[in-house]
């Protein structure tokens, strides 16, 4: 004979676990249905009735199978130094990342909480380590024989041009000036500009922290029946 299929809610046998997409309700002491992503538990199960699920309201979401009593609030709108890379839906939170020219100074589980403008190396200094999505530019003084005459988050120190006859010697912030005879440019390895980091932003506005930082359902646990493990042990 085929095994009898238990319909939720049901009392699990000793040492057995609730099935996938079910949870053990500590109050009812039964295995009950979870709610699908985009829904939440409107009414918890009892000995005789299963979980009643309802859709998340606008600007709220649940990302996982769950039995949270309320959907999570989506994070607030992305600030001016950010761009929305994932919209708020009933099944996922809004994700904000930093604009070009900015990096993430304070990350959150997904996206960025606080963006900051990439450091610009002033004349006499070049980029030692370029900025990334999550780290600032590192500047270094131009070594003898190199210079940078720009204020830039991407320019490295470049070698002075080599003159047949030097009119004005170069320094850290200025190239050598040659007399009218054509200069011989030293062979500098690589390009003059470093590539921009993948997620960089405009350099005008100050960074503003995102006020709302709702956690994702992957670590939000309901304060109700029991923890949302996919298969909870139940008797």
């Amino acid at each position: 004979l085929p095994a009898q299929v238990a319909f939720t809610p049901y009392a699990p046998e000793p040492g057995s676990t609730c099935r996938l997409r079910e949870y053990y309700d500590q109050t009812a002491q039964m295995c009950c249905s979870k709610c699908s992503p985009g829904q939440h538990a409107k009414v918890f199960c009892t000995k005789t009735s299963d979980t009643v699920c309802d859709s998340c309201e606008d600007s709220t979401y649940t990302q996982l199978w769950n039995w949270v009593p309320e959907c999570l609030s989506c994070g607030s709108r992305c600030s001016s130094d950010q761009v929305e890379t994932q919209a708020c839906t009933r099944e996922q939170n809004r994700i904000c990342t930093c604009r070009p020219g900015w990096y993430c100074a304070l990350s959150k589980q997904e996206g960025c909480r606080l963006c900051a403008p990439l450091r610009k190396c002033r004349p006499g200094f070049g980029v030692a380590r370029p900025g990334t999505e999550t780290s600032d530019v590192v500047c270094k003084p131009c070594a003898p024989g190199t210079f940078s005459n720009t204020t830039s988050s991407t320019d490295i120190c470049r070698p002075h041009q080599i003159c047949n006859v030097v009119a004005i010697p170069g320094n850290a912030s200025m190239d050598a000036v040659c007399t009218s005879t054509s200069p011989t440019r030293s062979m500098a390895p690589g390009a003059v500009h470093l590539p921009q980091p993948v997620s960089t932003r405009s350099q005008h506005t100050q960074p503003t922290p995102e006020p709302s930082t709702a956690p994702s359902t992957s670590f939000l646990l309901p304060m109700g029946p029991s923890p949302p493990a996919e298969g909870s042990t139940g008797d």
Epitope: Q26, Q29, M30, P222, S226, P227, G234, D235
Partner: antibody, heavy 115, light 111 residues
Framework: QVQLVQSGSELKKPGASVKVSCKAS????????MSWVRQAPGQGLEWMGW????????TYAQGFTGRFVFSLDTSVSTAYLQISSLKAEDTAVYFC????????WGQGTLVTVSS | DIVLTQSPDSLAVSLGERATINCRAS??????????MHWYQQKPGQPPKLLIY???NLESGVPDRFSGSGSRTDFTLTISSLQAEDVAVYYC?????????FGGGTKVEIK
């Protein structure tokens, strides 16, 4: 296998407090609630209430409000029963019992209140 | 809360004879195809030991001379052939309601 190990016997004076511990092993502590049961000398079993081991929310049976507090330390899979302002009539064996449809029991902790 | 009334209070049975203990609930303990009545054995100085769960299911490791029956409000624990080691107090317990309750206990002795 499921095991509930309780702290040892206590002898207390009236008015004092006592804290009984119940350490769980062999299962995920936060999946099942924990009940507390009292058995006075020569008497039957008396359900005191339970605590949701996930949320930490306690429920107390009639007659066990006020002086009785259930608490948890989930980091060490342990439930606690604290009784304050002890009276002679609190002398009993206190059991923790894992709350499923039926119980798995601790070995019991004898609390004696005597002047 | 649900009240469980156990009878008799005590019971003396000859070795090898049948022992029957009853437990009546003040309201139905049956829901979702289960009766949430459980039976425990307690010996002096020991915690209660589960014998029967959900009215009629024999707990692993418990001798099959123990059996449980009943539904809704009336339940019975039967020891088909009493052994010396069965001398103990037996309790019924309900988990139909959020608040558990126990019966008053039945002391089983050898006649």
């Amino acid at each position: 296998q499921v095991q509930l190990v309780q702290s040892g016997s206590e002898l207390k004076k009236p008015g004092a407090s006592v804290k009984v511990s119940c350490k769980a092993s062999g299962y995920t502590f936060t999946t099942f609630g924990m009940s507390w049961v009292r058995q006075a000398p020569g008497q039957g079993l008396e359900w005191m209430g339970w605590i949701n081991t996930y949320s930490g929310v306690p429920t107390y049976a009639q007659g066990f409000t006020g002086r009785f507090v259930f608490s948890l330390d989930t980091s060490v899979s342990t439930a606690y029963l604290q009784i304050s302002s002890l009276k002679a009539e609190d002398t009993a064996v206190y059991f923790c019992a894992r709350r499923s449809n039926f119980a798995y029991w601790g070995q019991g902790t004898l609390v004696t209140v005597s002047s | 809360d649900i009240v469980l009334t156990q009878s008799p209070d005590s019971l003396a049975v000859s070795l090898g004879e049948r022992a029957t203990i009853n437990c009546r609930a003040s309201e139905s303990l049956t829901a979702s195809g289960n009766s949430f009545m459980h039976w425990y054995q307690q010996k002096p100085g020991q915690p209660p030991k589960l014998l029967i769960y959900r009215a009629s299911n024999l707990e692993s490791g418990v001798p099959d001379r123990f059996s449980g029956s009943g539904s809704r409000t009336d339940f019975t624990l039967t020891i088909s052939s009493l052994q010396a080691e069965d001398v103990a107090v037996y309790y019924c317990q309900q988990s139909r309601h959020v608040n558990w309750t126990f019966g008053g206990g039945t002391k089983v002795e050898i006649k």
